[in-house]
Amino acid sequence: VSLRIQEGCSHLPSCCPSKEQEPPEEWLKWSSASVSPPEPLSHTHHAESCRASKDGPLNSRAISPWSYELDRDLNRVPQDLYHARCLCPHCVSLQTGSHMDPLGNSVPLYHNQTVFYRRPCHGEEGTHRRYCLERRLYRVSLACVCVRPRVMA
Amino acid sequence: VSLRIQEGCSHLPSCCPSKEQEPPEEWLKWSSASVSPPEPLSHTHHAESCRASKDGPLNSRAISPWSYELDRDLNRVPQDLYHARCLCPHCVSLQTGSHMDPLGNSVPLYHNQTVFYRRPCHGEEGTHRRYCLERRLYRVSLACVCVRPRVMA
């Protein structure tokens, strides 16, 4: 998809001129507010095991293995985001691939990703109303990482 | 600043009707709010060593530590992306935090991120020409992960 930028349109509702043609158009407005995923992701995942595989994708070969959980919102760009869910509280031993090593913690790496939400434009009504896209930061867990526990000074 | 996505406009150059107003557009005023890497950048960016710290950000406490390398493109949204660069070929021992363990590999986790590139609109010329934003997938390394080496069947 290609987007076109219009100058002088940093505040709604000015970003939704009504003199355009009638097909639905999507508009972007910007705000820096951040959004959290629907619910916190726990360590204990359903039926996936806490083990580091010797083949398969990187998330299953990691000694801090994780699964991906889909977060879909039809009014967001991107519609599909994936949250990493750690399968173990501690890191798996490199030797065995199964026993956990209490010296290491398996923790999620979080990132505030830029997303856009589709919202009805202010003052727009009717069948062919246009939409504004609102820029937000959305917290996603990208992966799980094996770290040495933090030592407080 | 607001952008418009036009339905049925997945291919350039159809996204740039020329009947808009003429004022110069200040591209990307709105993206100057730069996105930080998932973890704050450490001050000692120059001399990163292959060791797992007991404090500091997650990327330095990881047993597959990494640094972030800035990738800036003023014609892209977001302008700033950060690539994880692994500091060790193998994972660092959980015991010592410094010696490497040949049983584990420290490897980058790649992700195809959606970005937008500014392109001159087809048929647009002159001082006040408009721009189109073109949606692309861009490969970024998010983090480094400690994995068990792949065993070939």
Partner: antibody, heavy 125, light 107 residues
């Protein structure tokens, strides 16, 4: 031509587990999410969950977490669903269904556009 | 979860009739609604997505309409091969949910 070929009927003892397969052909397997649906007593359809074959990402209906494990084998373009700790309540026909996406990017619409023929699972001692 | 209700569980009609099957959602689903046909042999096919868009290969006698919480599927000129059970399904929010089905029979 898009086709989803499911494995044959299963008779399983209570407490046991079963793995159903769904072999895809006629399209790029990693480009489409795969859904799994349960039909009990030849009537109601109930969504179990979905898996993205590209990254293994899943979403489950809450009550099937711990009951259904979804996996894929990209090399053979096959999706699997393993059902655990089976009881008579799990006796049903299970369908795999490809999820197509429609409409202009980036706002897609989603529908289960191609379905497998169904796999009957009977739990009985 | 969003509840989908098909109040009519079975329906009898004559060949050539115009038949309407209704479906309601427990909340506004913004037209994010699909219709499926299940034949007596268990085969399931997508008929309509996004309330009113016909899937490829579906005869034009099928049409869909609705908005908000209320939706319907219409068969304008009933044919023998339309004997089946019809299900609505919302994709507004995960988990996806289906209506209970409406079984269409010939009088």
């Amino acid at each position: 031509e898009v086709q989803l070929q499911q494995s044959g009927p299963e008779l399983v003892k209570p407490g046991g587990s079963v793995r159903i397969s769904c072999k895809a052909s006629g399209y790029s397997f990693t480009g489409y999410t795969m859904n799994w649906v349960k039909q009990s007593h030849g009537k109601n359809l109930e969504w179990i969950g979905l898996i993205n074959p590209d990254n293994g990402g899943t979403s489950h209906k809450q009550r099937f977490m711990g009951k259904a494990t979804l996996t894929v084998d990209k090399s053979s373009s096959t999706a699997y669903m393993e059902l655990l700790s089976l009881t008579s309540e799990d006796s049903a026909v299970y369908y795999c269904a490809r999820e197509g996406y429609y409409g202009p990017s980036p706002f897609h619409h989603y529908a289960m556009d191609y379905w497998g023929q169904g796999t009957s699972v009977t739990v009985s001692s | 979860d969003i509840q989908m209700t098909q109040t009519t569980s079975s329906l009898s009609a004559s060949l050539g009739d115009r038949v309407t099957i209704s479906c309601s959602a427990s909340q506004d689903i913004s037209n994010y609604l699909n219709w499926y046909q299940q034949k007596p042999d268990g085969t399931i096919k997508l008929l309509i997505y996004y309330t009113s868009t016909l899937h490829s290969g579906v005869p034009s006698r099928f049409s869909g309409s609705g908005s908000g919480t209320d939706y319907s599927l219409t068969i304008s000129n009933l044919e023998p091969e339309d004997i089946a059970t019809y299900y609505c399904q919302q994709y507004s929010k995960l988990p996806y949910t289906f209506g209970g089905g409406t079984k269409l029979e010939i009088k």
